[in-house]
């Protein structure tokens, strides 16, 4: 091909090539042709004769102002035609007359201001019609019933001001899953406008300035329709009352989106007419008071998003939003509740009472004063089968005994990014009989005791990153009870002292993060009593991160028990010489990181076993000694291996001898070296 199109599996990509005409030298069997972002002004039908197998043609982002009706004659199998971002202004009855097999027609962002006659009457198989971002002033797309298989009609960002039944009755035989009318200036819903459509399942009116009274009229028009999904995001719905959604009483609405409405007042029984609702989006509003009956009637809601729905108006404490006790009691089917990023004063004793099916609750950054978690804080969740609780970013400073004793089903508890500073007695976790993961990373300080985790033997993941961990060297180890632990993160704690039994009994441990500590002394032969073998017995460990610990020595048997190790990170240490058989047992090693150490020599006797099955190696920024003795074997291995070695050319440079300084390691000439073959 003389053009620079890329062709793969019957797909030709000719985008972004400044083409002024359709290429005539592509394979004739292509089924997909992408001509987007070029300079095409027209699509001569003759140019497509050779591409009769096309099922998808995308000519978006060109300057096409007219379509030849014969185009589709040449493309009898065409299913998808994308003409978005062009300069079409007129559509005649002939334009798509031969495009009878189309399932998708994309005409967004053109200059179509009016549809005359019936340009889509032949599109009996059309499923998606996108006319968004044009200048249409009405929904009139034809004069006779048509488009009986249409499921998605996208008319957002036009100039539609009214919905009229006489304009929508062309869809009398259609079942529209999605009628997208967002970002229009709709001021009127004429009587029967939605009944003109055969069946309407989804209506999207985001960014339409409806306000409370037009919303009420809209809902009355939707009465006795098949509507399931209704989206009214950013529609200036500042208040709701018990009549706002009255019309929806005669529907089976399952999804309602009222996000971004600056909604201030949610009157009692506002949603009493929505007993079938399952998904309710209320995020980014400004609710000042949730009354005990505001959510009354929502018996079937499974998902409720209240993210950033309760925000304070001013600095004054008096302006904090209120949530009445028992406000959620009606939501008997609620499983997922998101209350992130709010300014709620605290948790009242009956705040969550009645949520008997709640499984996921996010309270991240939700409260203005939740400094202490007491044994009463979560009492209202006592009858909820909560599995996941997110309490991050709440400035929590203390967890008292029995704080979670009500949450016997809890599996994941996230307390990260708070200000917790305390001794962990273990009583904090009492009652968490099914706990799987506790995330405590990024807190003020945690002092461990032998019983810190005595009551949670089911725990499989424990995250203690950057918590100024104290007492980790006590014996018995605070982790002794955690025999099911698979992930332990102790990174960024500046730990300098640990015992050889710190991880004893953790035979199921798979991931151990110890990076950014101060463990160097423990592996020194000069350490009083000798090196500390704190990794012993971890026979199922897969990932070990020891980056940034200041290690300058590795005892020869330190990895002896780690038969299943797949990834080891020893980067950013001070390692120079490694003992000969240090990696002998790492037969499963896939990734080895030794970047930014002081390694000068990469010899077979040390690295041979580790490199055997490696898929990724990172030894960048080491001061390699480019001599036969030091790196000949390594260079030969590099040049024969399939292992991925990022930045090999630029960041593997010789440091010594002086005449090789800055020279790429991989270009070192080993031909004069003897016995340097990487594989035997």
């Amino acid at each position: 091909s003389t053009t620079k199109c890329t062709v793969s599996h019957e797909v030709a990509d000719c985008s972004h090539l400044k083409l002024t005409q359709v290429p005539d030298d592509l394979p004739t069997n292509i089924t997909v042709l992408n001509l987007t972002h070029n300079q095409l002004r027209r699509l001569p039908a003759a140019n497509f004769t050779r591409y009769s197998q096309l099922t998808s043609l995308d000519v978006g982002f060109n300057t096409i102002s007219k379509l030849e009706p014969e185009l589709c004659q040449k493309l009898p199998m065409l299913k998808v035609l994308n003409l978005q971002h062009n300069e079409l202004s007129q559509l005649s009855d002939k334009t798509f007359a031969f495009c009878t097999n189309l399932t998708e027609l994309h005409l967004m962002s053109n200059s179509i201001q009016k549809i005359k006659n019936n340009p889509f009457v032949k599109q009996k198989n059309l499923i998606t019609l996108d006319l968004s971002h044009n200048g249409l002033s009405s929904t009139k797309l034809g004069t006779q019933v048509q488009l009986e298989n249409l499921q998605e009609l996208l008319l957002s960002n036009n100039k539609i001001q009214a919905l009229k039944s006489e304009e929508l009755d062309i869809f009398a035989n259609s079942s529209l899953k999605k009628l997208e009318l967002s970002s229009n200036q709709i001021k009127e819903f004429s009587p029967g406008c939605f009944h003109a459509i055969g069946r309407l399942f989804g209506l999207f009116l985001n960014n339409v300035q409806l306000g409370p009274s037009l919303t009420e009229k809209l809902c009355l028009e939707l009465a006795n329709t098949s509507i399931r999904n209704l989206s009214l995001s950013n529609s200036q719905l500042s208040t709701t009352s018990n009549t706002t959604f009255l019309g929806l009483k005669w529907t089976n609405l399952t999804m309602l989106d009222l996000s971004y409405n600056n909604l201030n007042v949610v009157g009692n029984d506002s949603f009493a007419w929505l007993p079938q609702l399952e998904y309710f989006f209320l995020e980014y509003n400004n609710i000042q008071h949730l009354f005990s009956h505001s959510l009354h009637g929502l018996f079937n809601v499974r998902y409720l998003n209240l993210k950033r729905s309760f925000t304070k108006q001013s600095i004054s404490l008096a302006s904090l939003p209120k949530i009445d006790d028992f406000s959620f009691q009606w939501l008997k089917c609620l499983e997922h509740l998101n209350m992130e990023d709010n300014d709620i004063p605290g948790i009242k004793s009956n705040m969550f009472t009645g949520l008997i099916n709640l499984k996921y609750l996010s309270l991240s950054n939700s409260f203005t004063s939740l400094r202490t978690l007491t044994n009463e804080t979560f009492v209202s969740l006592a009858h909820s089968p909560l599995h996941i609780l997110n309490l991050t970013k709440n400035k929590i400073s203390k967890i008292e005994s029995d704080a979670f004793s009500w949450l016997g089903h809890l599996e994941v508890l996230d307390l990260g990014l708070n200000e917790i500073g305390q001794e962990l007695t273990g009583q904090e976790w009492r009652g968490l009989e099914n706990i799987f993961e506790i995330y405590l990373s990024y807190n003020k300080y945690l002092q461990l005791t032998r019983n810190s985790f005595a009551l949670v033997p089911s725990l499989q993941r424990l995250m203690l990153r950057r918590v100024a961990l104290k007492n980790v060297d006590s014996s018995p180890s605070p982790f002794q009870p955690l025999r099911n632990l698979t992930i332990l993160d102790l990174s960024n704690n500046n730990i300098a002292n640990i015992n050889d039994d710190m991880l004893e009994g953790l035979e199921k441990l798979e991931i151990l993060d110890l990076q950014h500590n101060n463990l160097a002394r423990l592996w020194k032969h000069a350490n009083p009593g000798g090196p500390i073998y704190f990794l012993k017995g971890l026979s199922h460990l897969h990932i070990l991160n020891l980056e940034s610990n200041g290690f300058d020595e590795i005892p020869v048997e330190v990895f002896k028990d780690l038969f299943e190790l797949k990834i080891i990170d020893l980067g950013l240490n001070n390692l120079n010489t490694l003992p000969a058989s240090v990696f002998n047992n790492q037969v499963s090693l896939k990734s080895l990181n030794l970047q930014k150490n002081l390694i000068t020599s990469v010899e077979k006797k040390v690295f041979g076993p580790a490199f055997r099955n490696l898929t990724e190696l990172d030894m960048r920024f080491n001061p390699f000694d480019c001599t036969c003795e030091s790196i000949a074997w390594f260079v030969n291995w590099i040049n024969e291996t399939h292992t991925n070695i990022p930045e090999l050319s630029s960041h593997y440079l010789c440091n010594t001898p002086p005449h090789y300084h800055g020279f790429p390691v991989r270009l070192f000439d080993t031909s004069s070296c003897k016995d340097s073959a990487p594989f035997e």
């Epitope: 007695t425 009583q427 032998r450 019983n451 005595a454 009551l455 014996s475 015992n499 039994d501 009994g505």
Partner: antibody, heavy 119, light 107 residues
Framework: QVQLVQSGAEVKKPGASVKVSCKAS????????IHWVRQAPGQRLEWMGE????????NYNEKFKTRVTITRDTSASTAYMELSSLRSEDTAVYYC????????????WGQGTLVTVSS | DIQMTQSPSSLSASVGDRVTITCRAS??????LAWFQQKPGKAPKSLIY???TLADGVPSRFSGSGSGTDFTLTISSLQPEDFATYYC?????????FGQGTKLEIK
């Protein structure tokens, strides 16, 4: 099943030493700490100390620290408690015990070893 | 060291009676309290741990309660095999001291 079997009864003279053994079976010996508890006739139980069979690390009750030595032999799956400078008030039944999944109780006990100190 | 005090030291009761034994710690031991039953010439047997959790195989007539410093062991309906000496022990910090015991006798 987990079993802790202790050595037989001993009679010792004041000032002597006694070494009681506790052989473990039914589990991996090095996985759980072994505790020693004693009970003098008609007295309450007294916790003496604990040993990590894996590395031999020990925590003693200060009351006994100068006289008691707790050791282990991993190859024999056996823990030992030696008490020196015996006096008559050391006459007691000496028990070894082990924690379970919950480390806050002793579900497993040896049968006890009676040590009599008499001149 | 934390001292454990049991009361009463002994008590007489009849089969079918409800019996309560208390245990007080000299400091806060949270809920790290265990109860043991011991019969003459035998090793102690674990009944309850973490103040209220029943050990494996222990009949439901036994129950425990309390937290901090004050704890109770209750036998709801005494059975003939329940006559024995009962000890509490804390597991908060070493040394793990025991109570002096409560001897439960047949009236």
């Amino acid at each position: 099943q987990v079993q802790l079997v202790q050595s037989g009864a001993e009679v010792k003279k004041p000032g002597a030493s006694v070494k009681v053994s506790c052989k473990a079976s039914g589990y991996t010996f090095t996985t759980y700490w072994i505790h020693w508890v004693r009970q003098a006739p008609g007295q309450r139980l007294e916790w003496m100390g604990e040993i990590n069979p894996n590395n031999g690390r020990i925590n003693y009750n200060e009351k006994f620290k100068t006289r008691v030595t707790i050791t282990r032999d991993t190859s024999a799956s056996t823990a030992y408690m030696e008490l020196s400078s015996l006096r008559s008030e050391d006459t007691a039944v000496y028990y070894c015990a082990r924690v379970g999944v919950m480390i806050t109780t002793f579900p497993y006990w040896g049968q006890g070893t009676l040590v009599t100190v008499s001149s | 060291d934390i001292q454990m005090t049991q009361s009463p030291s002994s008590l007489s009761a009849s089969v079918g009676d409800r019996v309560t034994i208390t245990c007080r710690a000299s400091g806060n031991i949270h809920n790290y309290l265990a109860w043991f039953q011991q019969k003459p010439g035998k090793a102690p047997k674990s009944l309850i741990y973490n103040a209220k959790t029943l050990a494996d195989g222990v009949p439901s007539r036994f129950s425990g309660s309390g937290s901090g410093t004050d704890f109770t062991l209750t036998i709801s309906s005494l059975q003939p095999e329940d006559f024995a000496t009962y000890y509490c022990q804390h597991f908060w910090s070493t040394p793990f001291t025991f109570g002096q015991g409560t001897k439960l006798e047949i009236k």
